[in-house]
Interface confidence: low
């Protein structure tokens, strides 16, 4: 091989010990736990005339593996057993007959950390490329799902919330989505990397958390995002009043039935006569309640559950103060990772006992 052809390989640090056999691959690759990576790889080997028509088999081995004894982590040889731990996750994606040794890793696991070397076999021509080796580093999963809310949430009106993990790869095991919500919900359609939750918020869902949890079962790792439903009182119907509750500041909204009717959606005609007066009462009581409740984490969960798969309960964060009948409610900074969603309430009639019970909806 001319020296000029070898220079770029030397520069890349990719020259194997035998100049007739060389391999070019990045020496280090980092992948987050549960995710995937495709490592481009090219190799070269001399082809004696007697091996010209032999099939080319490629193998990736973990460093220290003994060829005669240990199975590879990936190969294109169909009858070759591979390591149980990497089966289906490590693939020799490149075509060795075209000098391509590219390796695909999906559902990366912590124990995939380590170095790997490539071996080729073509008839009697066999060679293990011990240098360079590919070093795989598996790091913490830092990506988190996105929750998309189209427009404003209004009580009694169903909206589709989408939880997506667009950063996940297509080739990996499809993730398992779990939703945790106090509001009445049902599951909508899902794609490989997104799940839709149909939410029908009620007035008492103000200040409650909605969490989308995504589990990458192939690696046994979970990530989640929580948003907070932030209630604002925007009366649009002059005949609709707001019942203020007892002003105790207790956050004990019962949300027993997830697929049930929206509690307190109807209001009596009598309240309409006292609309302005009630607005002032609401203002006063909500201020008082907010001062008492913000920062508390009390829960009084009820046993009546209503989600198809009600498994998990979560503590309720305190509601935020509402300063006027029509103004937007300021949000309380509970967690820098907490995101807020707005609910516009045309009318409300919360129960005095307001302990919120959360339901989990799981989609697979």
């Amino acid at each position: 091989m001319p020296l000029l052809l070898l220079l770029p390989l030397l520069w890349a640090g990719a020259l194997a010990m035998d100049p007739n056999f060389w391999l070019q691959v990045q020496e280090s690759v980092t992948v987050q736990e549960g995710l995937c990576v495709l490592v481009p790889c090219t190799f070269f080997h001399p082809i004696p005339y007697y091996d010209k028509n032999s099939p080319v088999h490629g193998y990736w081995f973990r460093e220290g593996a003994i060829i005669s004894r240990d199975s590879p982590v990936a190969t294109n040889k169909l009858d070759q057993e591979v390591q149980e731990e990497t089966q289906g996750r490590f693939r020799l994606l490149g075509d060795p007959s075209r000098n391509n040794c590219s390796l695909s890793i999906v559902d990366a696991r912590r124990r995939d950390n380590g170095s790997y070397f490539f071996r080729m076999e073509r008839g009697s021509t066999k060679y293990s490329y011990k240098s360079p080796q590919l070093s795989v580093h598996v790091t913490d999963l830092t990506h988190r799902p996105k929750i998309l809310i189209p427009g404003t949430l209004e009580p009694g009106h169903s909206k589709n919330l989408t939880c997506s993990v667009s950063w996940a790869c297509e080739q990996g095991t499809p993730p398992i989505f779990s939703w945790l919500s106090a509001a009445p919900t049902s599951l909508g359609p899902r794609t490989t990397h997104s799940s839709v939750l149909i939410i029908t918020p009620r007035p008492q869902d103000h200040g409650t958390n909605l969490t989308c949890q995504v589990k990458f079962a192939g690696a046994g790792v979970t990530t989640e995002r929580t948003i907070q439903l932030n209630v604002t009182y925007v009366p649009q119907n002059p005949t609709t009043g707001i019942f203020p509750g007892d002003g105790s500041g207790k956050q004990e909204t019962r949300a027993g039935v997830v697929h049930g009717a929206i509690g307190g959606a109807g209001v009596t005609a009598l309240l309409a006569l006292c609309l302005c007066l009630i607005f002032f009462i609401v203002k006063t009581h909500r201020r008082k309640a907010a001062r008492t409740a913000v920062g508390r984490n009390d829960t009084h969960p009820t046993t009546g559950s209503a989600s198809p798969k009600h498994q998990k309960k979560s503590k309720l964060h305190g509601p935020t103060e509402t300063s006027s009948c029509s103004g937007a409610a300021p949000t309380v900074e509970m967690d820098e990772e907490l995101h807020y969603a707005s609910l516009n309430f045309h009318g409300m009639n919360p129960s005095k006992d307001t302990s919120t019970e959360y339901s989990e909806v799981r989609t697979q």
């Epitope: 973990r62 220290g64 593996a65 003994i66 004894r69 149980e84 731990e85 124990r111």
Partner: antibody, heavy 120, light 107 residues
Framework: EVQLLESGGGLVQPGGSLRLSCAAS????????MSWVRQAPGKGLEWVSA????????YYADSVKGRFTISRDNSKNTLYLQMNSLRAEDTAVYYC?????????????WGQGTLVTVSS | EIVLTQSPATLSLSPGERATLSCRAS??????LAWYQQKPGQAPRLLIY???NRATGIPARFSGSGSGTDFTLTISSLEPEDFAVYYC?????????FGGGTKVEIK
């Protein structure tokens, strides 16, 4: 500093059972294969069993297959050897040894050994 | 299984002398052979791996050579602490096997 400390040896009657432990420190335990190697009094070394770093693969010498079980608890950095149906010929010092690489190869670190005596 | 035969069984030499220990495999083990040193009452200690590579902290007077079926451990000039039993081990095939050992004793 890599350290391997065996325990659990002792005197046991033929047909009896014993469980050896090997506490490891000074290296990332889960990344390396581990083995048990024994040495009968005044004799040479005999490899007994090996286990891969994750515990997913195990290997045994024919002389102990079906009687001994190797296992590991990576959360405790501990290697185990459960020995059942013990015979007089199992009498030996049992060493816990760390493989240099992920799968069983040569051994770069050894424990000090624990003596197992099988006698009636 | 691969049988490793070490010779001689005992080697009587004086400090400063050269020691040559042999290990022969019943079939080729390529270069997948290691050498260990064991002193009475102690655990074995790795000297050489992959037939010719010295392990960390092993003095340069120890060297290994050979491939296939014939291997040699050479101690260029014996020090008093080198008198011990030496074992070879192959890791090319399961089961892993050791040679019977060569005892290097003071003459």
């Amino acid at each position: 500093e890599v350290q391997l400390l065996e325990s659990g040896g002792g005197l046991v009657q033929p047909g009896g059972s014993l469980r050896l432990s090997c506490a490891a420190s000074g290296f990332t335990f889960s990344s390396y294969a581990m083995s048990w190697v024994r040495q009968a009094p005044g004799k040479g070394l005999e490899w007994v069993s090996a286990i891969s770093g994750s515990g997913g693969s195990t290997y045994y010498a024919d002389s102990v297959k079906g009687r001994f079980t190797i296992s590991r608890d990576n959360s405790k950095n501990t290697l185990y050897l459960q020995m059942n149906s013990l015979r007089a010929e199992d009498t030996a010092v049992y060493y816990c040894a760390k493989s240099r690489y992920y799968y069983g190869d040569y051994f770069d670190y050894w424990g000090q050994g624990t003596l197992v005596t099988v006698s009636s | 299984e691969i049988v490793l035969t070490q010779s001689p069984a005992t080697l009587s030499l004086s400090p400063g002398e050269r020691a040559t220990l042999s290990c022969r495999a019943s079939q080729s083990v390529s270069s997948y052979l290691a050498w260990y040193q064991q002193k009475p009452g102690q655990a074995p200690r790795l000297l050489i791996y992959d037939a010719s590579n010295r392990a960390t902290g092993i003095p340069a007077r120890f060297s290994g050579s050979g491939s296939g079926t014939d291997f040699t451990l050479t101690i260029s000039s014996l020090e008093p602490e080198d008198f011990a039993v030496y074992y070879c081990q192959q890791y090319y095939f399961w089961p892993l096997t050791f040679g019977g050992g060569t005892k290097v004793e003071i003459k």
